[in-house]
Interface confidence: low
């Protein structure tokens, strides 16, 4: 369960791959379509709208949290368009959506080495946004193995 | 005034122990990761360890696996270093330092504290 | 040893521009950002650059970062006496899963 409705706290940062590939989002044909791009330099960041919220559920690992709870999150890059894990289809999705924000909307939010951050799928733990093929998917993490796999890392910049 | 400072610093015999504190204020420690850098008396700077905001991430350098050993208290705003079989190269000004958030490097650090080892 | 390397010395006189090396491997500044450190006599290092060529606020113009493959550098235009200091990089070590610095490098301003 996430403590309250309302975010605890937001932040606006562009998001960017462990291989500082920026995250960018295009409205093609009424959807959006999720690009992991090498940005030209004059082009500027797209900005996600980060919401922070406390769950009293640790996930499948423990990672940083705030007064051990943890840290859930929902991004939106533009207004009404939320990330959802799509768990059938290991993808992730921009979906118009309104709130309450279905749990696939949610991610728990870890902590890296040198302030990278990975995100972990509420409705699916071991479950995490990666990157596959220049795109954003859902990649299944062994905890035993590599958690600090490059292509589940992200940088969070303002 | 976001600041660091540290304490616990002394002379020390080879094999002995020493704890070392870093209290924080000014800013929301539990939200850092944390970190400890060395500096032996004329030479560079050496990173030691590291911890993450909820003490879920703890990274050593080769040079004192198994001796030291980071730990932190967020309730006390704490971050601590304890350090077992020193060693004379263990002797060095250590320092505590903030990850910054927005930086990914060390934004804020202690004044130091001086470690000897020495018989 | 250092796992990156940096030039022990460099000088300028004041005005001139003044530019630091440093090299590493791609598990270090080839993967990760280089963040530079400036440490004046008797006192903590103070961050100067971050993510390779981001100055810190209150940073003056005068410093500059950049990043190439596995090699950074710091450039210092414009030298002045105070920026007379040790200057060291850093970054993070995939392998290692360490942070690791350069030796450091005294600049002195003639």
């Known amino acids: 369960s996430i403590t309250g409705i309302s975010p605890i706290t937001e932040s606006l940062a562009s998001l960017s791959t462990y291989n500082d590939q920026s995250i960018t989002f295009a409205l093609e044909d009424e959807s959006y379509e999720i690009y992991v791009e090498d940005l030209k330099k004059d082009k500027k960041k797209d900005k996600v709208l980060l919401s922070y919220y406390e769950s009293q559920h640790p996930s499948s690992e423990s990672g940083d949290g705030v007064d051990g709870k943890m840290l859930m999150v929902t991004l939106s890059p533009t207004k009404d368009f939320w990330l959802q894990a799509n768990n059938k289809e290991h993808s992730v999705e921009l979906h118009k959506c309104e709130k309450p924000l279905p749990d696939q909307a949610f991610f728990v939010l870890h902590n890296r080495s040198f302030n990278c951050v990975s995100f972990e799928c509420k409705t699916d733990p071991g479950v995490f946004i990666g990157v596959k093929d220049n795109h954003l998917a859902l990649i299944k993490v062994d905890y035993s193995e590599n958690l600090g796999s490059e292509n589940i890392l992200f940088k969070l910049s303002e | 005034e976001v600041q660091l400072l540290e304490s616990g610093g002394g002379l020390v015999q080879p094999g002995g122990s020493l704890r070392l504190s870093c209290a924080a204020s000014?800013?929301?420690?539990?939200?850092?990761?944390m970190h400890w850098v060395r500096q032996a008396p004329g030479k560079g700077l050496e990173w030691v360890s590291s911890?993450?905001?909820?003490?879920?991430?703890?990274y050593y350098a080769d040079s004192v696996k198994g001796r030291f050993t980071i730990s932190r208290d967020n309730s006390k705003n704490t971050l601590y270093l304890q350090m077992n079989s020193l060693r004379a190269e263990d002797t060095a000004v250590y320092y505590c330092a903030r990850l910054g958030t927005r930086h990914d490097a060390f934004d804020i650090w202690g004044q130091g504290t001086l470690v000897t080892v020495s018989s | 040893q250092s796992v990156l390397t940096q030039p022990p010395s460099a000088s300028g006189t004041p005005g001139q521009r003044v530019t630091i090396s440093c090299s590493g491997s791609s598990s270090n500044i080839g993967n990760n950002a280089v963040n530079w450190y400036q440490q004046l006599p008797g006192t903590a290092p103070k961050l100067l650059i971050y993510a390779s060529n981001m100055r810190r606020l209150g940073v003056p113009d005068r410093f500059s970062g950049s990043k190439s493959g596995t090699s950074a550098s710091l450039a210092i235009s414009g030298l002045r006496s105070e920026d007379e200091a040790d200057y060291y990089c850093?970054?993070?070590?995939?392998?290692?899963?360490?942070?690791?610095f350069g030796g450091g490098t005294k600049l002195t301003v003639l």
């Open positions: 911890i993450s905001s909820s003490s879920s991430y703890i």
């Open positions: 850093a970054a993070w070590d995939d392998s290692q899963k360490a942070v690791v």
């Open positions: 000014g800013f929301t420690f539990s939200n850092y990761y």
